[in-house]
């Protein structure tokens, strides 16, 4: 028979309050005959945690059937973990003795420490929108975790970011810790549909990291481009002028027509369409009455986007003599 070894594979076991902790212990030999007991701590003051032979341990159950003759697994489960349960646990083999069993060999011990899961990461973007090519900052926060070791990563559309700074507080010993990270992201014109993700990995999460997200649509403003055109065809005595407002975000937009500097109050037809990249196009049609006394008409399409300074485009209406003639002919 090989000499008996006591195997406690985990040096550290992180447990959560209220959960069940499993402390592993196996032996490599059935000999010498004698019980395996569990203790917390060492020396004369050690606390008996489990003794199969005698005592009442309502929170402790064995993983294996200890009554089986060939059993070599003496692992235990402790239910309803509280902060008072932290410490180093030893499985100890006793050899039969008379009148008392004699301690034979101890396992190396497993330290049980309280682990607390981090809270779901919260990602906050900038207070105000910014235009493409500029840099914006996002912050990610997670709280209440223990132990202190934690990993945080940033992603934009699945691509890992490198421009960020992370702090874990406090720096000294604590029951629980917090993490705060700030990432700098350069905005692209197509970022309306983009997402930034803050990913937090911690030993208590068992390889399943927590993620917090923020949509760049909340942080970006894509200013519109304007184009005013006159339609070649006229309808009766009216000429159709179009103002195309392209590639803007967000949707918030005010469009006004001016005729020779005078704001027009009358209804105009318009359509709003969404582009694949999440930006919008707005098309507005303005009908201008053509008469003899109107030789030079300047139309202005003015757009106020998302509370910014208004931008405008002007068009000098081209009305040919032929068009005028047709117009006067058409008027009864």
């Amino acid at each position: 028979e090989e000499e008996l070894q006591m195997i406690q594979p985990e040096k550290l076991l992180l447990v959560t309050v209220g959960k069940t902790a499993t402390l592993h212990c196996t032996v490599t030999s059935l000999l010498p005959v004698g019980p395996v007991l569990w203790f917390r701590g060492v020396g004369p003051g050690r606390e008996l945690i489990y003794n199969q032979k005698e005592g009442h341990f309502p929170r402790v159950t064995t993983v294996s059937d200890l009554t089986k003759r060939n059993n070599m697994d003496f692992s235990i489960r402790i239910s309803s973990i509280t902060p008072a349960d932290v410490g180093t646990y030893y499985c100890v083999k006793f050899r039969k003795g008379s009148p008392e069993n004699v301690e034979f060999k101890s396992g190396p011990g497993t330290e049980m420490a309280l682990g607390a899961k981090p809270s779901a990461p919260v990602v906050l973007g900038p207070a105000a929108r910014t235009t493409p090519e500029h840099t914006v900052s996002f912050t990610c926060e997670s709280h209440g975790f223990s132990p202190r070791d934690i990993t945080l990563k940033w992603f934009k559309n699945g691509n890992e970011l490198s421009d960020f700074q992370t702090n874990v507080d406090p720096t000294g010993q604590s029951v629980a810790y917090s993490i705060r990270s700030t990432a700098r992201v350069v905005l692209d014109p197509w970022d309306v549909r983009s997402q930034v993700i803050c990913e937090v990995a911690h030993v208590t999460l068992q390889g399943d990291p927590l993620r917090g997200t923020a949509n760049l649509s909340e942080a970006i403003r894509v200013p519109p481009t304007l184009e005013v055109t006159q339609q070649p065809m006229r309808v009766g005595n009216q000429v159709n002028v179009t103002c195309q407002v392209r590639k803007f975000y967000p949707q918030s937009l005010q469009l006004t027509w001016s005729e020779n500097g005078n704001v027009c109050q009358r209804e105009t037809a318009s359509t709003l369409t969404e582009n694949k990249d999440g930006t919008y196009n707005w098309t507005s049609w303005f009908l201008v009455n053509i008469s003899d006394q109107r030789d030079d008409v300047v139309l202005t399409c003015q757009v106020k986007h998302d509370g910014q300074l208004a931008v405008s485009k002007r068009l000098a209406l081209e009305v040919t003599v032929h068009q005028k003639d047709q117009s006067s002919d058409a008027t009864p």
């Epitope: 028979e1 059935l30 000999l31 010498p32 005959v33 004698g34 019980p35 395996v36 199969q52 032979k53 005698e54 059937d65 200890l66 009554t67 089986k68 003759r69 060939n70 059993n71 050899r95 039969k96 008379s98």
Partner: antibody, heavy 124, light 106 residues
Framework: QVQLQQWGAGLLKPSETLSLTCAVY????????WNWIRQPPGKGLEWIGE???????NYNPSLKSRVIISVDTSKNQFSLKLSSVTAADTAVYYC??????????????????WGQGTTVTVSA | SYELTQSPSVSVSPGQTASITCSGD?????YAWWYQQKPGQSPVLVI????KRPSGIPERFSGSNSGNTATLTISGTQAMDEADYYC?????????FGGGTKLTVL
């Protein structure tokens, strides 16, 4: 304390299957291993195997290929079947209990109560 | 496989002490049991876990086990103690019996 009463066919022909049953009276059926031991005429004791209430078995390696020990907890009985018997299987067969209760560990319990024994003869 | 060896016979005068030995490799690391069997009867457990007596077994029966040898001692042997005695131990979930010792009370 537990008491054991055993029965089964006493005379067998070679190649037949020996079948014995042991009834348990008193005690908690779930805190024991239940054993079968045999003793050929004029010789010593030979352990055949054991079973507990959940059906966990251990067998003597020399007999393992021919032995089945089963348990019927509803009747508080356990049984032995030994197949393909020969004259060498002629013996007194005993059932015995091993009490482990709640305060024991592996190999700390032996055979504390024995049945009255059943003489089995294998002859052509 | 594990083996337990007993001397086939021991003789003792009434009132004297009889010692029956059982040897096996590192037997002291295991528990030893002792059974008494009288002619035509079922075995009876007389010592369990090396040195413990079941209720109903007289105090003159005692046991010890260390090294490679377990010993059953009967002090003040009586004629009624004449019987076959078997030691037993466990090896890898298998019960192993010694060959038995016939105790004769002269």
């Amino acid at each position: 304390q537990v008491q054991l009463q055993q029965w089964g066919a006493g005379l067998l022909k070679p190649s037949e299957t020996l079948s014995l049953t042991c009834a348990v009276y008193g005690g908690s059926f779930s805190t024991y291993y239940w054993n079968w031991i045999r003793q050929p005429p004029g010789k010593g004791l030979e352990w055949i195997g054991e079973i507990n209430h959940s059906g966990s078995t251990n067998y003597n390696p020399s007999l393992k290929s021919r032995v089945i020990i089963s348990v019927d907890t509803s009747k508080n009985q356990f049984s032995l079947k030994l197949s393909s018997v020969t004259a060498a299987d002629t013996a007194v067969y005993y059932c015995a209990s091993s009490h482990y209760g709640s305060g024991s560990f592996p190999d700390s319990y032996g055979m504390d109560v024995w049945g009255q024994g059943t003489t089995v003869t294998v002859s052509a | 496989s594990y083996e337990l060896t007993q001397s086939p016979s021991v003789s003792v005068s009434p009132g004297q002490t009889a010692s029956i030995t059982c040897s096996g490799d590192k037997l002291g690391d295991r528990y030893a049991w002792w059974y008494q069997q009288k002619p035509g009867q079922s075995p009876v457990l007389v010592i369990y876990q090396d040195d413990k007596r079941p209720s109903g077994i007289p105090e003159r029966f005692s046991g010890s086990n260390s090294g490679n040898t377990a010993t059953l001692t009967i002090s003040g042997t009586q004629a009624m103690d004449e019987a076959d005695y078997y030691c037993q131990a466990w090896d890898s979930s298998t019960a192993v019996f010694g060959g038995g010792t016939k105790l004769t009370v002269l």
